[in-house]
């Protein structure tokens, strides 16, 4: 899935995150000019992938997966085939629904982020994962981590690299 | 994940057990001269698989999949591509982790037999589940039950299809 | 068998501090996440903390943040409540709890308790 | 916080009846729901998890469904070690809240 054409710096941080790869975070990090109560704030999403398990990570990349190759994402229908999926989004732009998740993974109920996966047809194992994930990052970030965490997804949108 | 390189009649009861097929169980059972006391007792495990829904056999799949592809399990590093993931045991036989899970599935407490799934880094919601078949198991079968599953077992450790 | 054994509970005044103990044996510690619950007298049941099983993180119900800390002790299989500026609605009997499921991000069940400890805040 | 509400508060019955607890939550907790009986004087004990999961050692007699906001707890021939105090509880989040309690006693 070549989700990178839309705004790869945002899936780099994204997959650094979710794959528990310090380096890479911290280099993608740089890149956007991240503050260090920004960094600290995505090292502590990324702390909650690398406790629940290659599994958690796996099933979360599912997730992104899914939702930047749906129809709410893509220019045209895609064809059936992985090797064939595209995201012909606007532009470079990252996608809403895309955006939407990321926020309600951040600021939404556990209920209000896994209602909003559901939509896109995954599997309740995918979803009770979304969970564990949501409510792991709810209960290690503060609303100061929360708030620095959204300004710097606002420089990953806003950057160049996007 | 090709387990049944290991031992492919272990895993087609396994999944046959899981996946609450009566007829392919019954078909497996009959390969390894499964006494009749032996069906019934895994007749019992199935039951517990088929109450607890199709989620209960995914989650539990999973767990059998994560302990066969373990560092325990494998001869060597895995690579990290999917499809090059293979099982390369020394010869066709059962891994010890596995048999070790069966065990402790089968004797011992809820708790001794979480704590070793555990160890494979699963899911929480694949280790309440986990405890949910274990309880349903525990209360399901009797002492003889148990002793007629781990005969059974012995069967298929030392059968030619293993 | 799964024992956990809570000490420390008494009669304080508001306003003051006490500090709980729960002792727990019968199960690999470290692998738990580990809870404190009370129950007022007469009532039902509130959760108060949770400690996960290697002590990174810590939260608590509204009710106490800023007043109570919870804290474990691997070593000795022990974990604490600290309680400070205690009000009359803090009386209640605190019980200790084990996660029903070890490791990391496991759900608040509470599979196993303690046989509570009384804590009774009066002038 | 997730509001949870059981009824009735209060339940008369006789030994071998099939009795039926209710709990409500204010919001949805999709299955993460857990059930415990409390005698007096005694720590809860936990009987159901995940909606529906029988905890070790708890008899077949006590079953639970639902999903979402509405949950219940079976009782399919109640005992004379039945008689106590249940209560349910939520754990959708890291703010886990239990329901008032439905006393459970001798008609």
């Known amino acids: 899935v070549k989700m990178a054409e839309t705004c790869p710096i945002f899936y780099d941080v994204f997959f650094a995150v979710a794959n528990g790869n310090e380096l890479l975070l911290d280099l993608s990090l740089t890149k956007v000019n991240a503050t260090e109560p920004e960094r600290t704030a995505m090292k502590k999403i990324q702390d909650c992938y690398v406790e629940n398990g290659l599994i958690s990570r796996v099933l979360d990349g599912l997730v992104m997966t899914t939702i930047s190759s749906s129809k709410d994402c893509m220019g045209e229908a895609v064809q059936n085939t992985v090797e064939d999926l595209k995201l012909n989004t606007l532009g470079r732009e990252i996608c809403p629904a895309v955006k939407r998740g990321v926020d309600l993974f951040l600021t939404g109920t556990p209920d209000e982020y896994v209602e909003q996966v559901a939509q896109y047809k995954a599997l309740p194992v995918v979803l009770e994962n979304a969970r564990i994930l949501k409510n792991c990052v709810d209960a290690k970030m503060t609303e100061e981590d929360k708030e620095n965490a959204l300004s710097l997804l606002d420089k990953i949108y806003t950057s160049p690299l996007c | 994940v090709k387990m049944a390189e290991t031992c492919p009649i272990f895993y087609d009861v396994f999944f046959a057990v899981a996946n609450g097929n009566e007829l392919l169980l019954d078909l497996s059972l009959t390969k390894v001269n499964a006494t009749e006391p032996e069906r019934t007792a895994m007749k019992k495990i199935q039951d517990c698989y088929v109450e607890n829904g199709l989620i209960s056999r995914v989650l539990d799949g999973l767990v059998m999949t994560t302990i066969s592809s373990s560092k325990d399990c494998m001869g060597e590093a895995v690579q990290n591509t999917v499809e090059d993931l293979k099982l390369n045991t020394l010869g066709r036989e059962i891994c010890p982790a596995v048999k070790r899970g069966v065990d402790l599935f089968l004797t011992g407490t809820p708790d001794e037999y979480v704590e070793q799934v555990a160890q494979y880094k699963a899911l929480p919601v694949v280790l309440e589940n986990a405890r949910i078949l274990k309880n349903c198991v525990d209360a399901k079968m009797t002492e003889e039950d148990k002793e007629n599953a781990l005969s059974l077992l012995d069967k298929i450790y030392t059968s030619p299809l293993c | 068998q799964v024992v956990l054994v809570e000490s420390g509970g008494g009669v304080v005044q508001p306003g003051r501090s006490l500090r709980l103990s729960c002792a727990a044996s019968g199960f690999t510690f470290s692998s738990y996440g580990m809870h404190w619950v009370r129950q007022a007298p007469g009532k039902g049941l509130e959760w108060v903390a949770v400690i996960w099983y290697d002590g990174s993180i810590k939260y608590y119900a509204d009710s106490v943040k800023g007043r109570f800390t919870i804290s474990r002790d691997n070593s000795n299989n022990t974990i604490y409540l600290q309680m400070n500026s205690l009000r009359a609605e803090d009386t209640a009997v605190y019980y200790c709890a084990r996660a029903l499921i070890p490791v990391a991000g496991t759900d608040p069940i509470f599979g196993y308790w303690g046989q509570g400890t009384l804590v009774t805040v009066s002038s | 916080d997730i509001q949870m509400t059981q009824s009735p508060s209060t339940l008369s019955a006789s030994v071998g009846d099939r009795v039926t607890i209710t709990c409500r939550a204010s919001q949805s907790v999709s299955s993460w729901l857990a059930w415990y009986q409390q005698k007096p004087g005694k720590a809860p004990k936990l009987l159901i998890f995940?909606?529906?999961g029988l905890e070790s050692g708890v008899p077949f007699r006590f079953s639970g469904s639902g999903s979402g906001t509405e949950f219940t707890l079976t009782i399919s021939s109640l005992q004379p070690d039945d008689f106590a105090t249940y209560y349910c509880q939520q754990y959708n989040t890291y703010s886990p809240t239990f329901g008032q309690g439905t006393k459970v006693e001798i008609k």
């Open positions: 995940k909606t529906s």
